[in-house]
């Protein structure tokens, strides 16, 4: 017996040869002898199956002795054995009718699970084999489950069914609902200009939801809400501004903030948060600001960081073309007595400067 | 054709009220964030007011705002702005606009309406 | 509100001649920008949005570049119909605002 796998959804064609190159009487019928289709002369007859109105043949083949049996729109249920009668002979397939599934939607935020659900006949045995947009094999019976989806796992997973040796594929695609970063870090010398952006990984035609930026500066005790805003159509419209720091907010996506100056009081990190409607969980992305000032007191050139600085950054003082008078792995550094000249304070990480700032010492006289 | 055209606009002694209508044509009006954007004679353009196009939030620049109300009528077609309390400050030509599929500027304009605030 | 800065008011040219005009915002805009054209007892008419791209119908003797808060509008050969008024218009967020205007006149 020949078998056939089928897709939920899709049209197949089963066939059916005759041994003469011309139309002559045939019948397809089920496991139960439900005629579905034949022909009188020239004509489609169809009989009283389930099938009536998703089963068609080509009429054009009848003149070479082919007779297929097309069934569109598969369901599982139309799994069976189909007999093809034709020259006082039998032709029987066997047809398997599979279909998977995402558990709720294609759409999940980044870190939570996808589930794939295989529907298949009963009787049947399948095994599952998935691969996701970044080449990862997973396998499984009815059911494969895959926890924390990461923004990779964005895109066509392809899945092979496989039974009686024979396979089918299914494409499925995911939509792993993040930022493009999870986190981000902005230097700026004090007084500068501040923009954070929140680009999307995603694209969708509507986009609606909430956010909030909570802030925690590093002077600060405890966190306090920078803004507000809600997300509608992919405009974004602010609902609550804190007015220290009096933020500016872009009215399109990619969400887009500016601070109008960096000030030590500001510097620390962020966390912008945003819910989207009709799904459970929050996007997250995490951003920080660190905030250099070189100053000259006196007899005292003291240059100095705020925020949140990994212990491997080197902070140093040095005078303009020449060696570095100060370098340390600190928050802070200073010169006494500075000479005149231009001086560079700079925050670098392995020797890739990251931040610098320039300040003038005056002769004295 | 995408078309506005706006009406309304006349002389009005100061204190008095005003209101302007755009009627919009040949595209999904309700779609579309819309403007109002005036010019005083021998001046340049200056935005008045804004209303989106999903949210219908309303927006004014602090020269107008308190005074000066947006609305849209759907059924309609009609962008209006209601002017209250007018001054001679207020005396323009005011410009209805729509603004571009995911704003993309303001790529439509009316041929204008005049007001004129003096007693 | 975001102040826009236009510059310069006014400038004399001659036909053929490459003319920029500047445009700086007080805060950082991205590329939320657009240059409109103006002739008298006409209404604006829109240039350049996303403070790069060429609105549809606009001869391509037009360009505008920028983001942040420095933005740029070049006509590169200039033509008889350019001697207008053009302005740029932030549409960060609202209130939007406008630029000065700048009169370009034939000399």
């Known amino acids: 017996k020949k078998v056939v796998l089928g897709k939920k959804g899709d049209t197949v064609e089963l066939t059916c040869t005759a041994s003469q190159k011309k139309s002559i009487q045939f019948h397809w019928k089920n496991s139960n002898q439900i005629k579905i289709l034949g022909n009188q002369g020239s004509f489609l007859t169809k009989g009283p199956s389930k099938l009536n109105d998703r089963a068609d043949s080509r009429r054009s083949l009848w003149d070479q002795g082919n007779f297929p049996l097309i069934i569109k729109n598969l369901k599982i249920e139309d799994s069976d054995t189909y007999i093809c009668e034709v020259e006082d002979q039998k032709e029987e397939v066997q047809l398997l009718v599979f279909g998977l599934t995402a558990n709720s939607d294609t759409h999940l935020l980044q870190g939570q699970s996808l589930t794939l659900t295989l529907e298949s006949p009963p009787g049947s045995s399948p095994s599952v084999q998935c691969r996701s947009p970044r080449g990862k094999n997973i396998q499984g019976g009815k059911t494969l489950s895959v926890s924390q989806l990461e923004l990779q796992d964005s895109g066509t997973w392809t899945c092979t069914v496989l039974q009686n040796q024979k396979k089918v594929e299914f494409k499925i695609d995911i939509v792993v609902l993040a930022f493009q970063k999870a986190s981000s870090i902005v230097y700026k010398k004090e007084g500068e200009q501040v923009e954070f952006s929140f680009p999307l990984a995603f694209t969708v035609e509507k986009l609606t939801g909430s956010g909030e930026l909570w802030w925690q500066a590093e002077r600060a005790s405890s966190s306090k809400s920078w803004i507000t805003f809600d997300l509608k159509n992919k405009e974004v419209s602010v609902k609550r501004v804190t007015q220290d720091p009096k933020l500016q907010m872009g009215k399109k996506l990619p969400l887009h903030l500016t601070l109008p100056q960096a000030l030590p009081q500001y510097a620390g990190s962020g966390n912008l948060t945003l819910a989207l409607e009709a799904k459970t969980g929050k996007l997250h992305q995490e951003v920080n600001l660190v905030v250099m000032r070189a100053t000259q007191l006196q007899k005292n050139l003291t240059c100095e960081v705020w925020g949140p600085t990994s212990p491997k950054l080197m902070l140093s003082l040095k005078l303009e073309n020449k060696e570095a008078k100060v370098s340390k792995r600190e928050k802070a550094v200073w010169v006494l007595n500075p000479e005149a000249g231009m001086w560079q304070c700079l925050l670098s990480d392995s020797g890739q400067v990251l931040l610098e700032s320039n300040i003038k010492v005056l002769p004295t006289w | 054709e995408v078309q506005l055209l706006e009406s309304g606009g006349g002389l009005v002694q100061p204190g008095g009220s005003l209101r302007l209508s755009c009627a919009a044509s040949g595209f999904t009006f309700s779609s579309y964030a819309m403007s109002w954007v005036r010019q005083a004679p021998g001046k340049g353009l200056e935005w008045v007011s804004g209303i989106s196009g999903s949210v219908g939030s309303t927006y004014y620049a602090d020269s107008v705002k308190g005074r000066f109300t947006i609305s849209r009528d759907k059924s309609k077609n009609t962008l209006y702005l209601q002017m209250n309390s007018l001054r001679a400050e207020d005396t323009a030509v005011y410009y209805c606009?729509?603004?571009?599929?995911?704003?993309?500027?303001?790529?439509?304009w009316g041929k204008g309406t005049t007001v004129t605030v003096s007693s | 509100a975001i102040q826009m800065t236009q510059s310069p008011s006014s400038l004399s040219a001659f036909v053929g001649d490459r003319v920029t005009i500047t445009c700086r915002a007080s805060?950082?805009?991205?590329?939320?920008l657009g240059w409109y054209q103006q002739k008298p007892g006409k209404a604006p008419k829109l240039l350049i949005y996303a403070a790069s791209s060429l609105q549809s119908g606009v001869p391509s003797r037009f360009s505008g570049s920028g983001s942040g808060t420095d933005f740029t509008l070049t006509i590169s050969s200039l033509q008889p119909e350019d001697f207008a008024t053009y302005y740029c218009?932030?549409?960060?967020?609202?209130?939007?605002?406008f630029g000065q205007g700048t009169k370009l006149e034939i000399k």
């Open positions: 606009a729509k603004e571009g599929y995911d704003w993309s500027g303001m790529d439509v």
């Open positions: 218009l932030q549409d960060y967020n609202y209130p939007y605002t």
């Open positions: 805060q950082g805009i991205r590329n939320d």
